[in-house]
């Protein structure tokens, strides 16, 4: 892209952060080998990536989790990539599901989500999981990002 | 992008290659339906993609493997996307983990990694796995690439 | 990218559609939160994304499926991203495989495929699976797209 000032690169990659909050929305941080190209994309409240410019974005998330079939609910582990546009309800863009492992104490699995979506100015994207306590926060295991086409 | 000479497209997609080496770093080849846009990205020693220009890159890898819980170590199969910058330690950019299958003789699983990272001139990226003998090299199963934003 | 008329953005993201057809090629629709940037990429017959311009494209697919080891064939569930260029046989670009779950009635799993490939004018890409009846069509679970670099 190598764009000029009129059309700068917009990209972000943030790193998972363990949280004591009981919310199912994952928390992220600008730490480790993170990317935040400029102020046209920001991490808000540690939970959502918010863009200032309208356009097409490739948005992705990776979630690694450790769960056990007996200790978990019967429902699978689901990771959802969600969109919140100003003045609208949030909506699900992408979801992935993995049935819990029979490994003990828990079995690790990784989910990757990614797709191209039109975002409006002020739109935010975030990641929701069925059980945040099962998410793995070791180096590189769980991350979230976007790039503007 | 369709960029001019000042700002050419930079992209690569390489194909896994079975190796007799005992190293945990996967080997790749420019074979099959591969991509190598120009000499601003190169495959070095069959193991790392090296870039000549600084910038933001979307880097990805897909690894398919076949393993069995009883025949493998207790630790999960882990694939790591790593960065080696000149004069620095390698660092882990992304990791994914999958617990071994109970299927016999082995159960296939696929891992996908991808994210946006800043690379310096001369930086190399490579893929490391816990057990390269378990990796599947059939058409399309295991690949590695990048694109410059 | 924010390109001018000479070099417009080209991107698509389409949503899975349940089909009564017995074909192993997945069906897609422009519904929900889909993307179709312009007529330089089109969804043909609900099954393939066709591009009008030559160039490098990042192509991706995500497939979520629900299967059970006892009820399925011994072979794993395989999703393939395939290319059909004018006057040529189709070829496999990417594949991912997941062994069936032992969960009852079935266990959900998600597969993600993605890579950079050179496409010729008139080239089409499509997604093939071993058993389309096992594919999950709930919101966000199964999707397919591309973007031109």
């Amino acid at each position: 892209m190598q764009k000029g000032d009129q059309n700068p690169q917009i990209a972000a990659h943030v790193i998972s952060e363990a949280s004591s909050k009981t919310t199912s929305v994952l928390q992220w941080a600008e730490k480790g080998y993170y990317t935040m190209s400029n102020n046209l994309v920001t991490l808000e409240n540690g939970k959502q990536l918010t863009v200032k410019r309208q356009g097409l974005y490739y948005i992705y998330a990776q979630v690694t989790f450790c769960s056990n079939r007996e200790a978990s609910s019967q429902a699978p582990f689901i990771a959802s990539l969600c969109l919140k546009s100003p003045g609208r309800f949030e909506r699900i863009l992408l979801r992935a599901a993995n049935t819990h492992s029979s490994a003990k104490p828990c079995g690790q699995q990784s989910i990757h989500l990614g797709g191209v979506f039109e975002l409006q100015p002020g739109a935010s994207v975030f990641v929701n999981v069925t059980d945040p306590s099962q998410v793995s926060h070791g180096t590189g295991f769980t991350s979230f990002g976007l790039l503007k086409l | 992008m369709q960029k001019g000479d000042q700002n050419p497209q930079i992209a690569a997609h390489v194909i896994s290659e079975a190796s007799s080496k005992t190293t945990s770093v996967l080997q790749w080849a420019e074979k099959g339906y591969y991509t190598m846009s120009n000499n601003l990205v190169t495959l070095e020693n069959g193991k790392q993609l090296t870039v000549k220009r600084q910038g933001l890159y979307y880097i990805y890898a897909q690894v398919t493997f076949c393993s069995n819980r009883e025949a493998s170590s207790q630790a999960p199969f882990i694939a790591s996307l790593c960065l080696k910058s000149p004069g620095r330690f390698e660092r882990i950019l992304l990791r994914a983990a999958n617990t071994h299958s109970s299927a016999k003789p082995c159960g296939q699983q696929s891992i996908h990694l991808g994210g946006v990272f800043e690379l310096q001139p001369g930086a190399s990226v490579f893929v490391n796995v816990t057990d390269p003998s378990q990796v599947s090299h059939g058409t399309g199963f295991t690949s590695f690439g990048l694109l410059k934003l | 990218m924010q390109k001018g008329d000479q070099n417009p953005q080209i991107a698509a993201h389409v949503i899975s559609e349940a089909s009564s057809k017995t074909t192993s090629v997945l069906q897609w629709a422009e519904k929900g939160y889909y993307t179709m940037s312009n007529n330089l990429v089109t969804l043909e017959n609900g099954k393939q994304l066709t591009v009008k311009r030559q160039g490098l494209y990042y192509i991706y697919a995500q497939v979520t499926f629900c299967s059970n080891r006892e009820a399925s064939s011994q072979a794993p569930f395989i999703a393939s991203l395939c290319l059909k260029s004018p006057g040529r046989f189709e070829r496999i670009l990417l594949r991912a495989a997941n062994t069936h779950s032992s969960a009852k009635p079935c266990g959900q799993q998600s597969i993600h495929l993605g890579g950079v490939f050179e496409l010729q004018p008139g080239a089409s890409v499509f997604v093939n699976v071993t058993d389309p009846s096992q594919v999950s069509h709930g919101t966000g679970f199964t999707s397919f797209g591309l973007l031109k670099l």
Epitope: T139 | C82, R88, F89, R91, I92, N128 | -
Partner: nanobody, 120 residues
Framework: EVQLLESGGGLVQPGGSLRLSCAAS????????MGWVRQAPGKGLEWVSS????????YYADSVKGRFTISRDNSKNTLYLQMNSLRAEDTAVYYC?????????????WGQGTLVTVSS
């Protein structure tokens, strides 16, 4: 709590070999560069060797290059230093440490050390 426990030191004759081990616990060993530093009697800390998180990159002080080999086994959370062709000047207490830089003894965590004595 981070713990690094060195072992494998001892008395060895010039030209002999030793293999040092360092068992790590209390942190994600596989995510960190590690290394060995040493302190000869009456001298300051000297960096010996370091290794990246997955063992892809290794670095050595000129004084040990070609004689020492650093390695790690992330499945066992263990760091190793194979020392061959030992010389009297290699006599020191050897410490394993989490390394901040490939070439400098900058670290947050280190062990209690193991003594290597090279003497005839």
């Amino acid at each position: 709590e981070v713990q690094l426990l060195e072992s494998g030191g001892g008395l060895v004759q010039p030209g002999g070999s030793l293999r040092l081990s360092c068992a790590a616990s209390g942190f994600t060993f596989a995510s960190y560069p590690m290394g060995w530093v040493r302190q000869a009697p009456g001298k300051g800390l000297e960096w010996v060797s370091s290794i990246g998180p997955i063992g892809f990159t290794t670095y050595y002080a000129d004084s040990v290059k070609g004689r020492f080999t650093i390695s790690r086994d992330n499945s066992k959370n263990t760091l190793y230093l194979q020392m061959n062709s030992l010389r009297a000047e290699d006599t020191a207490v050897y410490y394993c440490a989490e390394m901040k830089s490939p070439y400098k003894p900058q670290f947050d965590y280190w062990g209690q050390g193991t003594l290597v004595t090279v003497s005839s």
